[in-house]
């Protein structure tokens, strides 16, 4: 099976690497623009220079290209708790991340929110907090894990999954209730 190529990929594949086919004259291969620049004018003829201009402030291109415009720099999303790790430059987009002792939860491929790492109160750290994963906690006896927090078995209702972990405590509570009735 031949992979399906878009028009642009078809045009580019006719030229050697680092060059692209002139949009008005498919016998001419123009040199692509370096990262940090964009295509202002196609090369006028074979062996002649492509007119590339540097990206303006607030925009970038991260690889060689023949884009008519630079890409807008990303902004870190304050409402998601994101902070700027490194600023946007002409050849690199803004890098956003989280503060110390926080991890990223990805809502989608490109959207993440910062959350505080769990401290494992009433438990121990099984796996330390990572850039993209919360601390994994192991709970002490008499506690069960709910949303990565160790919660007292006194909060375990019969309908919940915690019943297996809290079985002795539930039995005791049930026994206490039974002994109170005559």
């Amino acid at each position: 099976l031949v992979p399906h190529l878009g028009d642009r990929e078809k045009r580019d594949s006719v030229c050697p690497q680092g060059k692209y086919i002139h949009p008005q004259n498919n016998s001419i291969c123009c040199t692509k623009c370096h990262k940090g620049t964009y295509l202002y004018n196609d090369c006028p003829g074979p062996g002649q220079d492509t007119d590339c201009r540097e990206c303006e402030s607030g925009s970038f291109t991260a690889s060689e290209n023949h884009l008519r415009h630079c890409l807008s720099c990303s902004k870190c999303r304050k409402e998601m708790g994101q902070v700027e790790i490194s600023s946007c430059t002409v050849d690199r987009d803004t890098v956003c991340g989280c503060r110390k002792n926080q991890y990223r939860h990805y809502w989608s491929e490109n959207l993440f929110q910062c959350f505080n790492c769990s401290l494992c109160l009433n438990g121990t750290v099984h796996l330390s907090c990572q850039e993209k994963q919360n601390t994994v906690c192991t709970c002490h006896a008499g506690f069960f894990l709910r949303e990565n927090e160790c919660v007292s078995c006194s909060n375990c209702k019969k309908s919940l999954e915690c019943t297996k972990l809290c079985l002795p405590q539930i039995e005791n509570v049930k026994g206490t209730e039974d002994s109170g009735t005559t």
Epitope: R77, H105, W107, S108, N110, L111, Q113, E147, N148
Partner: nanobody
Framework: EVQLLESGGGLVQPGGSLRLSCAAS????????MSWVRQAPGKGLEWVSW????????FYADSVKGRFTISRDNSKNTLYLQMNSLRAEDTAVYYC???????????????RGQGTLVTVSS
């Protein structure tokens, strides 16, 4: 067929509370991030809140942070929105939706319910 049915809206005085519910069917509710979005009269759609499949992660718009609480009961296929300290500016039609974040911050979703009207007025 996917169905999202909101309930719990109504007229409430400023400072009052309401609890919205959304009954979901036709898809695996427990595996999906779910959200509440709203549309005030004459305005566009606005994110209110969303919650991860198991409820461990939540997001709130700045305008509702500290006043609204999103939760879910996967055993009942139901999404909730507890709204406290309601203000006149919270007046809107509230929709339960399965969000799509491709165009964030623009509101986008795979599907949403018919909505429930919340009116905050004295």
């Amino acid at each position: 067929e996917v169905q999202l049915l909101e309930s719990g809206g109504g007229l409430v005085q400023p400072g009052g509370s309401l609890r919205l519910s959304c009954a979901a069917s036709g898809f695996t509710f427990a595996k999906e991030t779910m959200s509440w979005v709203r549309q005030a009269p004459g305005k566009g759609l606005e994110w209110v809140s969303w919650i991860s499949p198991h409820g461990a992660h939540t997001f709130y718009a700045d305008s509702v942070k500290g006043r609204f609480t999103i939760s879910r009961d996967n055993s009942k296929n139901t999404l909730y929105l507890q709204m406290n300290s309601l203000r006149a500016e919270d007046t809107a039609v509230y929709y339960c939706a399965k969000p799509r974040f491709s165009y964030y911050p623009r509101v986008s979703f795979d599907y949403r319910g018919q909505g429930t009207l919340v009116t905050v007025s004295s």
